[in-house]
């Protein structure tokens, strides 16, 4: 279940947070999602390059997704199929996000309200959006332009793995424990 | 269709205060981001800030702190920005806009602000 | 804050010409750039924003391009309307900055 709004507001960063999406759903391996130089977008066990995103606030509780490297927006098809696409569409690329209790986050398509998953290891022609919503954990990346701050020891704002610290998402959302980078 | 209304223009005393109404129709008014942005005569444009207006929460260009501070009226779809301690740097036309992404994506016709003694 | 500087600050060209129009961001900004119009005594006007994606309503004869620190605004076949001011702005994030603008005019 999606948080309540019961959290003081975090007044810190702008709007644009560099995350790793980590999910370990039952349905596939653990996996960090990326978007990849040719417009495919898969899981791969450890972090890298292409794994590196952008989570952007558009308006409140909607975000895009942008993939560093590749510099592609993470794009859903009607059937639920993901790509990157180096052109945002906000129709494809828009997704409402809803942080859960346990610091996960839901992603589904502002358009067609179906969850974001990552393919299967099957054939890409079957159950490319497998029921259920799939549960993401943001994890922190290097902030884009500023160093890390050297040993910081002193517990972290609980921003977390919300796009947005600013409370910028919808009125009934929650913060997720993946602290901020 | 989407429409932002600001109030006619101001004539104020330096020292003084004004609070510019943006008053937004056509859309749902907490499905997006209001912000302003400041534009002195023959110059271009600088960024105030944005207020979520679901929440109040806002965004602010430190060059304006002190110096603008942003509200919303939820129940009568409204955005202010009051500006205080005016000078004549102040004198401008001050745009409310609607936000996507910081991206600003529908603008009001401005409210010209001109200080002056 | 990321400064905005754009180039040329005002040029002239005839209807039915191509112009370019160019702005450059002192650090990445990856894909978060957008254009506007302003015509003389008007609001500005969102054209593109995500570097390439054209606002509701923008003729196809606007496109963006570029990546990182440089990008550019190109306007194929100008039209006697598309004159006026132009100005790029990032939005990556904030403080959100604009250039200084582009004023172009009818030769």
């Known amino acids: 279940h999606p948080i309540p709004d019961s959290s003081p507001l975090l007044q810190f960063g702008g709007q644009v947070r560099q995350r790793y999406l980590y999910t370990d759903d039952a349905q596939q391996t653990e996996a960090h999602l990326e978007i990849r130089e040719d417009g495919t977008v898969g899981g791969a066990a450890d972090q890298s390059p292409e794994s590196l995103l952008q989570l952007k606030a558009l308006k409140p509780g909607v975000i895009q997704i942008l993939g560093v490297k590749t510099s592609r927006f993470l794009c859903q098809r009607p059937d639920g199929a993901l790509y990157g696409s180096l052109h945002f569409d906000p129709e494809a690329c828009s997704f409402r996000e809803l942080l859960l209790e346990d610091g996960y986050n839901v992603y589904q398509s502002e358009a067609h309200g179906l969850p974001l998953h990552l393919p299967g290891n099957k054939s890409p022609h079957r159950d490319p959006a497998p029921r259920g919503p799939a549960r993401f954990l943001p994890l922190p990346g290097l902030p884009p332009a500023l160093p890390e701050p050297p040993g910081i020891l002193a517990p972290q704002p609980p921003d977390v793995g919300s796009s947005d610290p600013l409370s910028m998402v919808g009125p009934s959302q929650g913060r997720s424990p993946s602290y901020a980078s | 269709e989407v429409q932002l209304q600001q109030s006619g223009p101001e004539l104020v005393k330096p020292g003084a205060s004004v609070k510019i109404p943006c008053k937004a129709s056509g859309y749902t008014f907490t499905d997006y981001y209001m912000g302003w942005v400041k534009q002195s005569h023959g110059k271009s444009l600088e960024w105030i800030g944005d207020?979520?207006?679901?929440?109040?929460?806002?965004i602010n260009n430190q060059n304006f702190k002190g110096k603008a501070t942003l509200t919303v009226d939820k129940s009568s779809s409204t955005a202010y920005m009051e500006l205080r301690s005016l000078a004549s740097e102040d004198t401008a036309v001050y745009y409310c806009?609607?936000?996507?992404?910081?991206?600003?994506?529908?603008w009001g016709q401005g409210t010209s602000v001109t200080v002056s003694s | 804050d990321i400064q905005m500087t754009q180039s040329p600050a005002s040029l002239s060209a005839s209807v039915g010409e191509t112009v370019i129009i160019t702005c450059r961001a002192s650090?990445?900004?990856?894909?978060?750039l957008a254009w506007y119009q302003q015509k003389q005594g008007k609001s500005p006007q969102l054209l593109v924003y995500n570097i390439r994606t054209l606002a509701e309503g923008v003729p196809s004869r606007f496109s963006g391009s570029g990546s990182g620190t440089q990008f550019s605004l190109k306007i194929n076949s100008l039209q006697p309307e598309d004159f006026g001011s132009y100005y790029c702005?990032?939005?990556?994030?904030?403080?959100?900055?604009f250039g200084g603008g582009t004023k172009l005019e009818i030769k």
């Open positions: 650090e990445n900004i990856y894909s978060y």
């Open positions: 207020i979520n207006p679901n929440n109040g929460v806002t």
């Open positions: 806009t609607r936000g996507y992404g910081g991206a600003l994506d529908y």
């Open positions: 702005q990032h939005h990556y994030d904030s403080p959100w900055t």
